[in-house]
Amino acid sequence: TIPPHVQKSVNNDMIVTDNNGAVKFPQLCKFCDVRFSTCDNQKSCMSNCSITSICEKPQEVCVAVWRKNDENITLETVCHDPKLPYHDFILEDAASPKCIMKEKKKPGETFFMCSCSSDECNDNIIFSEEYNTSNPDLLLVIFQ
């Protein structure tokens, strides 16, 4: 997708729905493209992106991409259509309400990516698999 300052006029009258028949409307996502980041060796990080965009299309989801090489760390935040690959990878977790980072194989760098479908969900990127649970007892163990 494209950030709001260069958005085109679109008028798609089709109502987009999810698998349960719920109406999908344009989502709110953090949208700072690529920025240098200090996020490293943490269970989760905030994006520190102050730009919240209304995604261009109802089917788009929030995406975050974390990359580390010998020189720097960057965090990319965008809206993207999960039917299309991003950085040559399928957005397999697009229906998740939280942005749970998954490592991807990229030569010469450490590369993590997540996608999610709740408003501004790419503001909080989660590296620890412990967060990926709906078990309250487990959460008690994590945070005690």
Partner: antibody, heavy 116, light 107 residues
Framework: QVQLVESGGGLVEPGGSLRLSCAAS????????MSWVRQAPGKGLEWVGR??????????DFAAPVKGRFTISRDDSKNTLYLQMNSLKTEDTAVYYC???????WGQGTLVTVSS | DIQMTQSPSSLSASVGDRVTITCRAS??????LNWYQQKPGKAPKLLIY???SLQSGVPSRFSGSGSGTDFTLTISSLQPEDFATYYC?????????FGQGTKVEIK
Amino acid sequence: QVQLVESGGGLVEPGGSLRLSCAASGFTFSNAHMSWVRQAPGKGLEWVGRIKTTYSGGATDFAAPVKGRFTISRDDSKNTLYLQMNSLKTEDTAVYYCTLDLRQYWGQGTLVTVSS
Amino acid sequence: DIQMTQSPSSLSASVGDRVTITCRASQSISSYLNWYQQKPGKAPKLLIYAASSLQSGVPSRFSGSGSGTDFTLTISSLQPEDFATYYCQQSYSTPPTFGQGTKVEIK
């Protein structure tokens, strides 16, 4: 289709309290930031406040005239948004709309009248 | 808070006229601007978001332009159902503030 239905409005004396509800259906409520916007009789639109998704911490923000008096909460299990209004003033008289934050869906509004 | 100023506050026009409403922000808001239409006794309806993106189902005679501090809503050929009040709203920062409204009346 998407529906937002407000309830709980009515006549209340200055200094009193009222709780508005907004029942949401037709979309994944838990995934959406929600807002309240009000409109005094014959006046323009005024943003009241918002609540973010529980996934992003459920943080709330308020307009200066209502800060400290109004609170917003949500019950994702009931697909319901709430606006708790305390220490009401005559200038809070308005139609209150529940809205999907910054987007196209609004409720029909509920009238709150603060008068002695 | 960012102040939004609309002009004119009201205008009279005839069916078929081209109508332009302007909205000025007190500081740069990039393209974070929405336009709403409201008819008496009804909830506002979103017409344009992100300054120029037409909301699904909105007729193409409505268009939005601008960035930074100056924005325009244009109705290329006014129709009977377009007589209403129009509001701009910035979504660049909290609180998201509205303009005072522009009432479009029948001449």
